[in-house]
């Protein structure tokens, strides 16, 4: 039960996180005009990964896309790449984790397969979250650097007389959305990895021996009552005593790679 809850919660948290990463990537407010200690302009500038916008005092907003690839700063391209990689990995992770969910039964999928898929999606969520956090952090660092550079030349003299209104940019809402979303995806991934341990089969690498009685048959499986190290009940060892006789092949268990986690 605890495994299902952990896995389900991990999935939901990751889903919210990935939705947040997508939202942050699409948002226009990655950097917004700094209004503190600045000449108050009647226009408000803000920029995203894909376009820059200007809002007039009337509320009229005009946005222009960056219709160039080569002309954009390498850092911006890197941030775009990190966010897209994060989204792609997260989307694949979500797809994998849906099939890995313990509460969903698809054919006769083995628990070991579900454990593998849970671990895979968990790792994908972790990497996705890290990509988003890295992307947002790179952009934030770029902003901080530019902020202090423009503060240093707040008023650049032109011909000694003319002053330039230096538009300084500060952290936009998308950065905070991205950080939170990346963190949630990361947490969700960790939860999936933890859930994977509970899903993993716990049998030891012994050949099962079948004892055939003439009357009421009982299959005895060594290690059947061994303590589970996972978070949930030992899923492979639920039915120890069964009414019908079993062949050796039926009760024989093979070690899973998760037995040694």
């Amino acid at each position: 039960m605890a495994v299902t809850a952990c896995q389900g919660l991990g999935f939901v948290v990751s889903l919210i996180g990935i939705a947040g990463i997508i939202a942050a990537t699409c948002m226009d407010q990655w950097s917004t005009q700094d209004l503190y200690n600045n000449p108050v302009t009647a226009v408000f500038n803000y920029q995203g990964l894909w376009r820059s916008c200007v809002r007039e005092s009337s509320g009229f907003t005009e946005c222009r896309g960056y219709f160039t690839l080569l002309g954009l700063p390498a850092m911006l391209q890197a941030v775009r790449a990190l966010m897209i990689v994060g989204i792609v990995l997260g989307a694949i992770g979500l797809l994998v984790s849906i099939f890995a969910l313990k509460c969903i039964r698809i054919g006769s999928m083995e628990d070991s397969a579900k454990a593998n898929m849970t671990l895979t999606s968990g790792i994908m969520f972790i990497v996705s979250g890290l990509c988003a956090i890295a992307g947002v952090s790179v952009f934030a660092n770029m902003l901080v650097t530019n902020f202090w550079m423009s503060t240093a030349n707040m008023y650049t003299g032109m011909g000694g007389m003319v002053q330039t209104v230096q538009t300084r940019y500060t952290f936009g809402a998308a950065l905070f959305v991205g950080w939170v979303a990346g963190g949630l995806t990361l947490i969700g991934g960790v939860m999936m990895c933890i859930a994977c341990r509970g899903l993993a089969p716990e049998e030891t690498n012994y050949k099962a021996v079948s004892y055939h009685a003439s009357g009421h048959s009982v299959a005895y499986k060594p290690g059947g009552f061994k303590a589970s190290t996972g978070f949930g009940s030992n899923t492979k060892n639920k039915k120890i005593y069964d009414g019908g006789a079993r062949t050796e092949d039926e009760v024989q268990s093979y070690p899973s790679k998760h037995d040694y986690v």
Epitope: A42, V43, C53, S57, S58, M158, T167
Partner: antibody, heavy 119, light 113 residues
């Protein structure tokens, strides 16, 4: 077509206050900024300040802070400018002007109110 | 505050002539976000309120005759009337509508011979 109606003239005594009105018709009043501009004989135009009726957000020229108070009555689509502690320096034509939607320029102007400060 | 300096303060021309008036600001009025210059030109005829002619330094307001042309960038702006008509007798003001407080130039008075 947007129209801004202002009273033609106001005669006030020094030290007194006056409240100039500007009634808008033919547009969504709350959407656009309403600005006030002062014009003294033989001098240029001076921006006093602006108010956004939607949220009563104001912007004042620091030179007129304490002198002018901008308010709006959304129900009657009317903007008001109160001028206090009047002196002869305040004798001028006061225009209300509605901001454009697409830019910060003043697209529509009232005919102006002549404020005369005289004992 | 941004200071808008207009020149000349007045000029007298004959109908059909080309007129150029200048406006200089002590601070750049170019917004880097959209590469627009926030300068507006108004025409004030005697006994009338000002009328919007040109915004964003070069965009003509609807209904304004195409003989009026605005140009310039950052700190230097120009209003050109390609062929002056008798009805163009007025005072022309440039305005900073970028940085608060909005400021106007002292005006250029256009007189017709």
């Amino acid at each position: 077509q947007v129209q801004l109606q202002q009273p033609g003239a106001e005669l006030v005594k020094p030290g007194a206050s006056v409240k100039v009105s500007c009634k808008a018709s033919g547009s969504t009043f709350t959407t656009y900024w309403m600005h006030w501009v002062k014009k003294r004989p033989g001098q240029g135009l001076e921006w006093i300040g602006g108010i956004r009726p939607f949220d009563s957000n104001t912007n004042y020229n620091h030179k007129f802070k304490g002198k002018a108070t901008l308010t709006v009555d959304k129900a009657s689509s009317t903007a008001y400018m109160q001028l206090s502690s009047l002196t002869s320096e305040d004798s001028a034509v006061y225009y209300c002007a509605m901001g454009a939607y697409y830019s910060n320029s003043f697209a529509y102007w009232g005919q102006g109110t002549v404020v005369t400060v005289s004992a | 505050d941004i200071v808008m300096t207009q020149s000349p303060s007045s000029l007298t021309v004959t109908a059909g002539e080309k007129v150029t008036m200048n406006c200089k600001s002590n601070q750049s009025l170019l917004n880097s976000g959209n590469q627009k210059n926030y300068v507006t030109w108004y025409q004030q005829k005697p006994g009338q309120p000002p009328k919007l002619l040109i915004f964003w330094a070069s965009t003509r307001e609807s209904g304004v005759p195409d003989r009026f042309t605005g140009s310039g960038s950052e700190t230097d702006f120009t209003l050109i009337i390609s062929s002056v008509q008798a009805e163009d007798l007025a005072v022309y003001y440039c305005q900073n509508d970028y940085v608060y407080p909005f400021t106007f130039g002292s005006g250029t008075k256009l007189e017709i011979k």
